[in-house]
Each structure stands twice: as C-alpha cells, then as structure tokens.
Interface confidence: low
C-alpha cells in the first residue's frame, strides 16, 4: 500500500486534498482513493482513480462538519492492496470580512459577505458585553443574509459580537470583533445672559443614561488653540463662562462623558457684548 497519507481540507473552498507517498511495488497501474461518510452519516461517497505517477488528488463538495473516512489503495491490474486510511472532518467555513456600520448609542450594524456553500443554513449572531462572557443577545439569520442590526444596547459599552456559520449538525468557529456603542451627546445648546465678559450656556442632557459628567470647552474663534475646559456635574445642565474677552466670538462645545468615553461634541458660537464706554 502507499504510505504517509496526508489529508488537508480548505474550509474556504470546500476542497479536500489527499496526498501520499507512492508505493514501492513495481509495475502498479494506479491508485484508487475513496471518501466515505463514517458511521452511516448522510453524505456523498466519492471515488477517484489516478495514474501511478501521481501522489495526490482533490475532492470537491464535501459536507463541512461531517466525518469522512479517506482510503487510498494501490491498484495493479485487477488487484488492490489493503488501503491506507484516515478520517477527517472538514471545518465549517467562517466569515472573514465581518465589519461594523451605522453605530449609534444603542445599536451596531453588522455587514459580511454570505458564504457560497449550499450546506450553510444560516448564521448565529451572539452579543456579549465585553468582559462578561455571557451572551446578552442571540439571533439567527438565513444563509443569504449579509447584514444585521444589533439593537437594545447600552451607550458607551464595549460589545464582543460574534457571527457563527451554521450547518445541519455543526457550526464554524466564531468570527468575533469588538465595538463600542456611542455615548449620546447633549442637545439644544443655548446662550443667555450675554455680557462683555460672561455668558450662560445651557443644554439638554441625553435621556436614558447616567453620565459621569459633561465637558464644556470654549475658545475665541480666532484663537482656537487657547481652549479652556470645564467639567460639569451630570446633574447640571448649565454653566456660566467668565473672564471672557469683550466683543469676541467664542466657539463653545459640550460633550457627554460616560466612564472614560466621550460623545461627539455639541457645538455653538456666541459673541460677547461690548464694554460700555
């Protein structure tokens, strides 16, 4: 019989490569290679016959997740050697191009290219708050689907999101990426009580999140490097800016902060009054 049987399944292409060291028996006519699902499992039995000078062959369309017995026989005329055999379970292909889109404070959109395999019956999406190890959300989509929106998430949290390829009776290794939901910004920026060196800034806090604080940054429009920063209690939604320059336009931004995460800033401009003569 041949020796050193080696089996290699490519999960991306579904191709099984069978290789061996050629028999030392003289004048052989070739090799017969069979792949058969073990233990009476449902699946195709395949066979190839190759020339004596070949030491490998390939099989397409093996069912991932199914165990196959692979045997190689030396053939001489109408006689066969005892086979050299091994088993292999072709892996279920996993996604390679998972990406995130349309991230908000409560949702994360997923995109991927559906895998081209008739054995795939769908994908399982699992969401875990980073570091918890416990799935907080799980859903299933059909094999033709290449998008999903995970909703009902909390703002400013890192989530580990996994997509697993499903076949009948098996699944792939997970493709996992981590993404943080956004911290919602404040809204409705207003300026009141404008004086030559002061102004009152108010805003509406975002709903449904217990913030750590607000960050208020302000600087003259013509000198934005000269920025001052104030940290405001999350229970406050106003601040009075003092020691401003008269008759000067200021750019003011207010950001929400949740733990170490900052929202996109809410920006506005306001000019201070002129000094009375």
């Amino acid at each position: 019989p041949p020796t050193n049987l080696h089996l290699e399944a490519n999960p991306d292409t579904g191709v099984l490569t069978v290789s061996w060291e050629r028999s030392t028996t003289p004048d052989i006519t070739g090799y017969r290679i069979t792949t058969t699902p073990t233990n009476g499992q449902q699946g195709n039995s395949l066979e190839e016959v190759v020339h004596a000078d070949q030491s490998s062959c390939t099989f397409d369309n093996l069912s991932p997740g199914l165990e196959y017995n692979v045997s190689v026989y030396t053939v001489k005329d109408d006689k066969e050697s005892v086979p050299i055999s091994d088993t292999i379970i072709p892996e279920v292909p996993q996604l390679t191009d998972l990406s995130f889109v349309d991230i908000t404070d409560s949702s994360i959109g997923l995109r991927w290219t559906p895998l081209n395999s008739s054995t795939i019956i769908g994908y399982r999406i699992t969401v875990v708050a980073a570091g918890e190890g416990i799935p907080i959300f799980e859903d299933f989509v059909d094999s033709s689907v290449g998008y999903y929106t995970v909703t009902g998430l909390e703002p400013g949290i890192d989530y580990d999101i996994s997509v697993i390829t499903l076949i009948n009776g098996g699944e792939s290794a997970p493709t996992t990426l981590t993404q943080q939901t956004a911290v919602p910004p404040p809204t409705d920026l207003r300026f009141t009580n404008i004086g030559p060196d002061t102004m009152r800034v108010t805003w509406a806090p975002p709903p449904s999140i217990d913030l750590t604080n607000f960050l208020v940054r302000y600087s003259p429009v013509k000198n934005e490097e000269d920025v001052a920063e104030l940290s405001i209690s999350p229970s406050d939604n106003a601040v009075v800016l003092t020691n401003l320059l008269p008759g000067t336009e200021y750019v003011v931004s207010v950001s929400s902060v949740y733990e170490q995460h900052e929202s996109t800033p809410l920006r506005g401009r306001q000019k201070t009054g002129l000094d009375s003569p």
């Epitope: 949702s107 019956i121 769908g122 708050a129 190890g133 416990i134 799935p135 907080i136 959300f137 799980e138 859903d139 299933f140 989509v141 059909d142 689907v145 998008y147 999903y148 929106t149 995970v150 909703t151 009902g152 998430l153 499903l166 699944e171």
Partner: antibody
C-alpha cells in the same frame, strides 16, 4: 413613545383561522427580533414564535409549528401572526414583545377564544 | 410543566424581604445565558423588571434585585410594598439550534400580607 398595540383577537370555532396584528410605534420593527408570547387563562407565559431582526428567519414552538405563521410588513411597521387550524388549547391572551436585551417592550395583549 | 422551575407563591408583610428562585438546567441558565425577570400586575401585560441577571431598566425601584449562580437565579424584593403584589416570571434563552427558543418559569404569585 415606544409602543406595541395588538389587534385581531376574537371568538373562533375549532379548526378556524385568525390573523393577529401588532402595530409598532416609536421604533423600527425590522431592527429587532420580535416575538409572540401567549398566556392561557390562569396560566403562565408561553413563547409562541419569533421573527429575527434583520434576517427574517422564523421560529415556532412545537405546539404551533405548521399551524401558525409569523410575518411582518416593514412598510407598515407591523408584526402579524396567522393562526390556522385553531384548537381549544390555543385559547389565550396573545402578546407581541420586542426583544432587546430581553423582552423590553410588550403590547397590551389581544384575546383569542377557540370554542 | 415549565422548563424553568419557580415556587408557585411567596408572601411577606410590608417592609419584609422576599426571594423567588428560578431553577433551570445546562440547556438554558447553566449554558451561560442571561436570566430576565418580568412582573405582571393583575389584569395587565408583563413588564420587564430585571434583565441580564441583575440589571434594572430605568424606572424600576432599587428594592428589586436579581442574581444568578450556576443553573439557577433568584429575584429579591426588599422593603415589600402593597403595589408589589403581582405574578413574577423568570425567562432564559434555550439551546436548540436554529429554534430561537425562549423558556419561561411557571410564575410566582407574590402576596403582601
């Protein structure tokens, strides 16, 4: 305001059909996995069916498989449950529920009586 | 018979602490899935009370708390009040490939004496 409102319940004879509707407002129905859950008189909650968010995959409890069909019309932001071959044991209040981290929003329920 | 097991009823005087247990198996709670709790006041729809084992949605009083260990979970109500008289249900996803299954406990009636 985020809200679910069911309708379509009523009295029906065994073997008959009903279609329940669940109108969603304040959020986009297609972004969420949506469920039907029922509660027989004096009994506990029983999961009936699910339609997945994003994908349109559907799942059913064994007790209703082959008789009930869950669907949704994204343009109307409405979830449906088509119930055929109804039996006395299907008598219950039927709730639609949105699945976020849990069933975070429930409708008020619609009563189905099979008699 | 429900997949998750809860006591049919518990009771307590106002101000007391009561706990409701929810026992599952390695196919649901023990598989690492979250447990959620729902409150159903008489004649109304269920309402989410605790999600992800121990988290309270906004608007739920902090006298309600949840915990989970192994294949079981529990809901505690401290400082019991008359308006807490209701049915309480635990829930968890269920391992069942491509089934989307969700299982509930049989419910526990809380009576305020």
């Amino acid at each position: 305001e985020v809200q679910l409102v069911e309708s379509g319940g009523g009295l029906v004879q065994p073997g008959g059909s009903l279609r329940l509707s669940c109108a969603a407002s304040g959020f986009t129905l297609s972004s969420y996995a949506m469920h039907w859950v029922r509660q027989a008189p004096g009994k506990g909650l029983e999961w009936v069916s699910t339609i997945s968010g994003g994908g349109g995959s559907t799942y059913y409890a064994d007790s209703v498989k082959g008789r009930f069909t869950i669907s949704r019309d994204n343009s109307k932001n409405t979830l449906y449950l088509q119930m055929n071959s109804l039996r006395a044991e299907d008598t219950a209040v039927y709730y639609c529920a949105r699945r976020g981290r849990a069933f975070d929003i429930w409708g008020q329920g619609t009563t189905v009586t099979v008699s | 018979q429900s997949v998750l097991t809860q006591p049919p009823s518990v009771s307590g005087a106002p101000g007391q602490r009561v706990t409701i247990s929810c026992t599952g198996s390695s196919s649901n709670i023990g598989a690492g899935y979250d447990v959620h709790w729902y409150q159903q006041l008489p004649g109304t729809a269920p309402k989410l009370l605790i999600y992800g084992n121990s988290n309270r949605p906004s608007g739920v009083p902090d006298r309600f708390s949840g915990s989970k260990s192994g294949t079981s979970a529990s809901l505690a109500i401290t400082g019991l009040q008359a308006e807490d008289e209701a049915d309480y249900y635990c829930s968890s996803p269920m391992i069942s490939s491509l089934s989307g299954h969700v299982v509930f406990g049989g419910g526990t009636k809380v009576t305020v004496l």
